[in-house]
């Protein structure tokens, strides 16, 4: 019969031959033959390979270096990496978490919109009108200015969107 | 048809060095099979693993003889090779390379004798 | 690690069926599908006869078959043939690219 030109999923050409790929977690040894099977062998501890594959090595699984303030997320097994996240009060610096700097905090004047997680950065938001924050903060949302009216008290300062509003007694004298 | 075939001193005297060479024919080492293996058997006795070595040069050894044996490789002279160090009587053997790790192309085997 | 454990000797007469045991441990035989198998007839190199437990190479007869339990695999040959007497060997994957052997089985047909 005429050698094969192409092959079937999880099969590759090699030497006018239709091969079987290696599954996920193992690596290949030897292309089969007109014997036997292709060869294929586990990959070892801290090793993996997540596809169908003819790789002669395993990766190595991601180290995840606490020095950079780097932890483990979810432990490789031999089909998958490791992943990596930040400590606490850091996040990623990349999609493929290398290296992790510190949460960045809202100035005063600024809210938290969104806390940031191991992967995203927080993010702020302008105090808007009637809103604010005194404080730098990854954590505070902004507050809204204190009602002096529910207090049975009047405004003696008006609030910005760095400080909240002063309330003082209603002038009694006025009519 | 992939051959291969080990050559080497027949007689090694005790504390010197075994050196053992298998030369692949028939087929690259380098593609194909990417492992190259190396298993003994003393007279009368079962066979043992020694080691096996990838094309580009990693090499995993059996831990009983780890410290004493070097496998490498000359993907050039399609060749892969055995050392043995501060060899005994305990080394004498008949000493076969095998492609892969599954072992099914094997060399003849070559006889080495360790005595004074 | 150590040697994988097999009868010395096995017999049968022609036409029986033989079973050849293989007893590892977790590491190796138990802790991987690659148990292979060997024929060595008298100042001969081994022979491939089972891999991967269960996998004939092809021109191996089909009298030849392998299991595994366990941590035991075991290599049956139905309709012994005279030309089946031979030592037969074991062998397991046990990780981190390490192989080990069993100790060898001499099958003798009566």
């Known amino acids: 019969p005429e050698p094969p030109t192409a092959c079937r999923e999880k099969q590759y050409l090699i030497n006018s031959q239709c091969c079987s790929l290696c599954q996920p977690g193992q690596k290949l040894v030897s292309d089969c033959t007109e014997f036997t099977e292709t060869e294929c062998l586990p990959c070892g501890e801290s090793e993996f390979l997540d596809t169908w594959n003819r790789e002669t090595h395993c990766h190595q699984h991601k180290y995840c270096d606490p020095n950079l303030g780097l932890r483990v997320q979810q432990k490789g097994t031999s089909e998958t990496d490791t992943i990596c996240t930040c400590e606490e009060g850091w996040h990623c610096t990349s999609e493929a978490c290398e290296s992790c700097v510190l949460h960045r905090s809202c100035s005063p004047g600024f809210g938290v919109k969104q806390i940031a997680t191991g992967v995203s950065d927080t993010i702020c938001e302008p105090c808007p009108v009637g809103f604010f924050s005194n404080v730098s903060s990854a954590f505070e949302k902004c507050h809204p200015w204190t009602s002096c009216e529910t207090k049975d008290l009047v405004v003696q300062q008006a609030g910005t969107n760095k400080t909240d509003v002063v309330c003082g007694p209603q002038d009694r004298l006025r009519a | 048809q992939l051959q291969l075939q080990e050559s080497g001193p027949g007689l090694v005297k005790p504390s010197e060095i075994l050196s053992l060479t298998c030369t692949v024919s028939?087929?690259?080492?380098?593609?194909?099979?990417?492992?190259w293996g190396w298993i003994r058997q003393p007279p009368g006795k079962g066979l043992e693993w020694i080691g096996n070595?990838?094309?580009?040069?990693?090499?995993y050894y059996s831990p009983s003889l780890k410290s004493r044996v070097t496998i490498s490789v000359d993907t050039s002279k399609n060749q892969f090779s055995l050392k043995l160090n501060s060899v005994t009587a305990a080394d004498t053997a008949v000493y076969y390379c095998a492609k892969g790790f599954r072992f099914d192309y094997w060399g003849q085997g070559t006889l080495v004798t360790v005595s004074s | 690690q150590s040697a994988l454990t097999q009868p010395p000797s096995a017999s049968g007469s022609p036409g029986q069926s033989v079973t050849i045991s293989c007893t590892g441990t977790?590491?190796?035989?138990?802790?991987?599908?690659?148990v292979s198998w060997y024929q060595q007839h008298p100042g001969k190199a081994p022979k491939l006869m089972i891999y991967?437990?269960?996998k004939r190479p092809s021109g191996v007869p089909d009298r030849f078959s392998g299991s595994k339990s366990g941590n035991t695999a075991s290599l049956t040959v139905s309709g012994l043939q005279a030309e089946d007497e031979a030592d037969y060997y074991c062998?397991?994957?046990?990780?981190?690219?390490?192989?080990?052997f069993g100790g060898g089985t001499k099958l003798t047909v009566l």
């Open positions: 062998s397991s994957y046990a990780g981190s690219n390490n192989l080990v």
């Open positions: 991967e437990v269960s």
């Open positions: 028939g087929g690259s080492i380098s593609s194909s099979s990417y492992y």
């Open positions: 070595i990838y094309y580009r040069g990693d090499t």
């Open positions: 977790s590491s190796d035989v138990g802790g991987y599908n690659y």
